[in-house]
Interface confidence: low
Amino acid sequence: GSGVFQLQLQEFINERGVLASGRPCEPGCRTFFRVCLKHFQAVVSPGPCTFGTVSTPVLGTNSFAVRDDSSGGGRNPLQLPFNFTWPGTFSLIIEAWHAPGDDLRPEALPPDALISKIAIQGSLAVGQNWLLDEQTSTLTRLRYSYRVICSDNYYGDNCSRLCKKRNDHFGHYVCQPDGNLSCLPGWTGEYCQQPICLSGCHEQNGYCSKPAECLCRPGWQGRLCNECIPHNGCRHGTCSTPWQCTCDEGWGGLFCDQDLNYCTHHSPCKNGATCSNSGQRSYTCTCRPGYTGVDCELELSECDSNPCRNGGSCKDQEDGYHCLCPPGYYGLHCEHSTLSCADSPCFNGGSCRERNQGANYACECPPNFTGSNCEKKVD
């Protein structure tokens, strides 16, 4: 049942040992009790004991104290279990009867075997506290106490809330005095079925099947499932949502594995040359004077370009080159002549003409000869 009405008989006094009719019991009043619990009636009347009935064996003769039976067997206090919401009101009839023999059934007793009958009614809230009462008639006195308590797993003001503590797949909770659930540590939700994940575990990207756990949903990683997993094979990129591959600066391609900044990452140009990116994995080196090659790795000999004129010979130097001019010539490239037409500088029949700017003369060569002095034969 949802609750139990408990009646504790404490003392019955019948000093003269008489029945309700006034007739004495022979040899004494062997007293037992019948209890009837029913719904509230303004005037308690006969009829079915709608909340239950209970009777006792013979408890004593005439006047006696009733021993408390704390074994819980339902003997004293008497137990009247009920299986409904306690209404908060009741009627109670307690009859004391004389048992001339061993048969205590109503039909086996003479009608005048009644010693006394009390009837009370009123309000009674569920609670642990006993209500003490004493009812006195001209001949008898009965002292007793009563209360209503909830059965195991029933709670609330009317014992109407069923709550059974549990710690399994269907819930992890204990019951509060009002019947509400109180979740065990690490659990939440209406029936405490939902585990509380590791503190900080991402609400959307993480989940858990037991407290303090953080399991990641597909595409997420990290202790708190707040780091996305980039596209498989992403080399130089990151993600803001799973399976993305957003390239770092200087990288391109689907997997961010194509170098767009070869100059910075590899410094391919040598000897102080200037590097320019010109596409994926391509670059151009602009060499300083004196250097050549794709990466300006080759040092040039400046004499290779035959800078010395008029038969001057070229010599490489650390900072460039030097022309050794033949007699009659001078200048950086032996371009200036100290000769004039009077010195007959033109060979092979070349004709000499005086000049004013730069050189002092110029040779006009016959066919098949060239050079500033017609000194070279053209094959």
Epitope: R34, P48, T50, T53, P57, G73, R105, P106
Partner: antibody, heavy 118, light 107 residues
């Protein structure tokens, strides 16, 4: 003299319905509860359910809950057992009994046989 | 539901024997136990109520005892008319339950 007389038993097909009656006499019908108890052939006694004729409140064994309904007509001093969705395992002799002060059965009817078979 | 377990399920005895039948409840039922006698083709008859009280008209050779979970029906001197099946019943809860019965046969 206290008397309880059942009627209404018979053969019914599985899934069918039947209503049993229990006519009471010789005592105040509204001051007692009436219980129905059944006994399958060669088996023991099984409490089926009860009714408080005065209030109409009733209770049932788990095995029949939702299928059987107990009612009472106080003007006729008669209790009824309405049996629906009958099964082969409901085959039994059905007794009504007076459920006296303390919950024991001091008077019984003679019983009526219900056979559920196709 | 409270289960009532009776033992033995059957026994053979002779007229004049003392016979004891026991009934064990699956939980405490105070003294809310009754005993019944049933003969073939007949309705059960009440023998004992409230564990130990003899019902009106029942011979005094029948007696009952016990409280809590263990109960006993004793027939002090078996008579020919006592050969029958005996059932215990608990009425501690609204959902009354019976034991499975003990058949007392002639030896």
């Amino acid at each position: 003299e206290v008397q309880l007389v059942e009627s209404g038993g018979g053969l019914v097909q599985p899934g069918g319905s039947l209503r049993l009656s229990c006519a009471a006499s010789g005592f105040t019908f509204t001051d007692n509860w009436i219980s129905w108890v059944r006994q399958a052939p060669g088996k023991g006694l099984e409490w089926v359910g009860l009714i408080n004729p005065q209030s109409g409140s009733s209770d049932y064994a788990d095995s029949v809950k939702g299928r059987f309904t107990i009612s009472a007509d106080t003007s006729k001093n008669t209790a009824y057992l309405q049996m629906n969705s009958l099964r082969a395992e409901d085959t039994a002799v059905y007794y009504c009994a007076r459920d006296n002060f303390g919950g024991y059965f001091d008077y019984w009817g003679q019983g009526t046989l219900v056979t559920v078979s196709s | 539901d409270i289960q009532m377990t009776q033992s033995p399920s059957s026994l053979s005895a002779s007229v004049g024997d003392r016979v004891t039948i026991t009934c064990r409840a699956s939980q405490d039922v105070s003294t809310a136990v009754a005993w019944y006698q049933q003969k073939p083709g007949k309705a059960p008859k009440l023998l004992i109520y409230s564990a130990s009280f003899l019902y009106s008209g029942v011979p005094s050779r029948f007696s009952g005892s016990g409280s809590g979970t263990d109960f006993t029906l004793t027939i002090s001197s078996l008579q020919p008319e006592d050969f029958a099946t005996y059932y215990c019943q608990q009425s501690y809860t609204g959902q009354s339950t019976f034991g499975q019965g003990t058949k007392v046969e002639i030896k």
